[in-house]
């Protein structure tokens, strides 16, 4: 927790709240993250195969950021998703997209972030992924790509 | 603060936030900011030669946009950075970053944003700055470039 | 809400938050806001022709996203501005904006997306509101263009 | 059909200061950057400023930079060039030009004002 | 900063001739460079952008080409409302001028 160890616990409630930043090693989708070690927290919601689960229904505000680069620009199209899963509903929810497309000039190096957040009603035991649509573009670096949210 | 007197003081503690704007005499990193005039507000956090200043330990949502433009499109790598300091600790911490490469034109006029938000577990006494990798390629309207927190 | 009824009321005092979602009929400025189907949130806080209006005093963040995109880059600058209303003053505010400038290749298929968010102090009857400088190059999907808000 | 016309050119001491201005039409004038150009008699061509738009950006070169400040008012279609601390060596034939869809060229010109800085 | 240096400085030519007027760029400046004439009294008149790409409404006589440092345009049939002087500007880093090239009657 930046370098803190984290506060000492209150007698208040346990406040819900996770950031997760990017783990090098993911290999297929949705994305996997560092959950333990650098600037990393995770309080009060369990983080499973990818996915932040919920473990208290209310509002929570969730957000993503996913640095992508690469060697030499071809403008493949490059999507960000943060979506919802519940075993209750068949289809995974798309909660927030980003998508960019001809955002760099070919044979170039190139970078671009792609940022998301915003406000949803959760569910206990709804699962939250981020997916990407070129992982090999995706720089990990915990400052760079991560996965967060916190309950109102 | 958005041309309104700001809030009654109520009971409650007062509630640690943070909205700073740009300041175009900035000169040097980390930015500067403007912290008494404007769309400005400073509750609970001091302002110290750039940076917010942690006064309760806690979680904080922190967030900045940086917007960059230019006249004559280059391509120079640009970067935006919050980071921590604090003097317990040797090293500042990187927090957050964007970096964009190949994002314009050659030769066009340009402008891009880069935004940054996530939380995090601060400590009393942290100080956070704001750094960019060229000054001159920064606009600093009020609206356009910033940087804040507030305490969950 | 993400398919979820709403949590069942608290005797604690109702939150206050907004997410609304892109209306693909959108026809002039403002933008126009999906307020009741989908993945929207609508509570302690009214919407009313384009506009989230503020009912308590207090402090909120704020945030918005859009989505363009186009069928032939032309390089038209595009402009997302969230700014406030209210009717003891003249002049609309700017609290945040976002500009984009030869961000894609001329001639081909593109899309970029504009991310603002922040704190602001809001005083009851404030309206907010999002604006767009190209109408026609924004795409309304709910996961793409949204904007939002809750009181801290 | 396109049109932008300079005025308020004159002699002026070193030192003083003048104000220029350009009132454009037969274009949406708040869609496009306008430069400043200037050209000293019998000589070439020297770009002076630019303004965005929306009037949000300016950019100026070296030679001018802190003395001259570049504006535009969208709502009257005109844009405006205010020299202060003038030298012998900004007198020049003053052009206004429309930049060509934000690439630094520029597509059409004015027909220029004379300021001459003399004592 | 780029400098941009024309030559020849003046070119004597009678009507009908085939005229070359040469640009360089003190350093790379891919194809963005524009030309411009410019006639005593008056101001510049837009013609090619992109170092070959002519504006509409100039004559087809008119061309450009080049591309790094080396730029011409080319008078295929000189005309007698064509002499005038001619000015390069590159618009790849910045805004630069050449010192112009005035093209008289011989």
């Known amino acids: 927790q930046i370098g803190h160890p984290s506060p000492p616990p209150e007698k208040k409630e346990q406040r819900k709240v996770a950031h997760l930043t990017g783990k090098p090693n993911s290999r297929s989708m949705p994305l996997e993250w560092e959950d333990t070690y650098g600037i990393v927290l995770l309080s009060g919601v369990k983080y499973k195969k990818g996915g932040l689960v919920i473990n208290e229904t209310g509002l929570y505000f969730v957000y993503s950021k996913v640095y992508f680069r690469g060697q030499s620009c071809t403008n493949l199209p490059l999507s960000h998703k943060v979506y919802m899963r519940n075993s209750k509903y068949p289809q995974d929810l798309v909660m927030m997209e980003g998508k960019m497309m001809s955002y760099c000039t070919t044979g170039q190096m190139w970078a671009h972030s792609s940022y998301l957040g915003a406000v949803f009603n959760l569910t206990s035991a709804d699962h939250l992924y981020v997916n990407v649509s070129e992982l090999s573009l995706v720089n990990f670096e915990e400052s760079q790509t991560f996965f967060g949210l916190y309950k109102l | 603060q958005i041309g309104h007197p700001s809030p009654p003081p109520e009971k409650k503690e007062q509630r640690k936030v943070a909205h700073l704007t740009g300041k175009p005499n900035s000169r040097s990193m980390p930015l500067e900011w403007e912290d008494t005039y404007g769309i400005v507000l400073l509750s609970g956090v001091k302002y110290k030669k750039g940076g917010l200043v942690i006064n309760e330990t806690g979680l904080y949502f922190v967030y900045s946009k940086v917007y960059f433009r230019g006249q004559s499109c280059t391509n120079l790598p640009l970067s935006h950075k919050v980071y921590m300091r604090n003097s317990k600790y040797p090293q500042d911490l990187v927090m957050m970053e964007g970096k964009m490469m190949s994002y314009c034109t050659t030769g066009q006029m340009w402008a891009h944003s880069s935004y940054l938000g996530a939380v995090f577990n601060l400590t009393s006494a942290d100080h956070l700055y704001v750094n960019v990798s060229e000054l001159s390629l920064v606009n600093f309207e009020e609206s356009q470039t910033f940087f804040g927190l507030y305490k969950l | 809400q993400i398919g979820h009824p709403s949590p069942p009321p608290e005797k604690k005092e109702q939150r206050k938050v907004a997410h609304l979602t892109g209306k693909p009929n959108s026809r002039s400025m403002p933008l126009e806001w999906e307020d009741t189907y989908g993945i929207v949130l609508l509570s302690g806080v009214k919407y009313k022709k384009g506009g989230l209006v503020i009912n308590e005093t207090g402090l909120y963040f704020v945030y918005s996203k859009v989505y363009f995109r186009g069928q032939s880059c032309t390089n038209l600058p595009l402009s997302h501005k969230v700014y406030m209303r209210n009717s003891k003053y003249p002049q609309d505010l700017v609290m945040m904006e976002g500009k984009m400038m030869s961000y894609c290749t001329t001639g081909q298929m593109w899309a970029h997306s504009s991310y603002l968010g922040a704190v602001f102090n809001l005083t009851s009857a404030d309206h907010l509101y999002v604006n767009v400088s190209e109408l026609s190059l924004v795409n309304f999907e709910e996961s793409q263009t949204f904007f939002g808000l809750y009181k801290l | 059909q396109v049109q932008l016309v300079e005025s308020g050119g004159g002699v002026v001491q070193p030192g003083r200061s003048l104000r220029l201005s350009c009132a454009a039409s037969?274009?949406?004038?708040?869609?496009?950057?306008i430069h400043w150009v200037r050209q000293a008699p019998g000589k070439g061509l020297e770009w002076v400023a630019v303004?965005?738009?929306?009037?949000?950006?300016?950019f100026y070169a070296d030679s001018v930079k802190g003395r001259f400040t570049i504006s535009r008012d969208n709502s009257k279609n005109t844009l405006y060039l205010q020299m202060n601390s003038l030298r012998a060596e900004d007198t020049a034939v003053y052009y206004c030009?429309?930049?060509?869809?934000?690439?630094?060229?520029?597509?059409?010109w004015g027909q220029g004002t004379l300021v001459t800085v003399s004592s | 900063d780029i400098q941009m240096t024309q030559s020849p400085s003046t070119l004597s030519a009678s009507v009908g001739d085939r005229v070359t007027i040469t640009c360089r760029a003190s350093q790379s400046i891919s194809s963005w460079l524009a030309w411009y004439q410019q006639k005593p009294g008056k101001a510049p008149k837009f013609l090619i952008y992109q170092a070959s790409s002519l504006e509409s409404g100039v004559p087809s006589r008119f061309s450009g080409s080049g591309s790094g440092t080396e730029f011409t345009l080319t008078i295929s049939s000189l005309q007698p409302d064509d002499f005038a002087t001619y000015y390069c500007q590159q618009y790849n880093s910045y805004i630069t001028f050449g010192q112009g090239t005035r093209l008289e009657i011989k």
């Open positions: 303004i965005w738009y929306d009037g949000s950006d300016k």
């Open positions: 030009a429309r930049d060509r869809d934000n690439w630094n060229y520029f597509d059409y």
């Open positions: 037969g274009f949406t004038f708040s869609t496009y950057g």
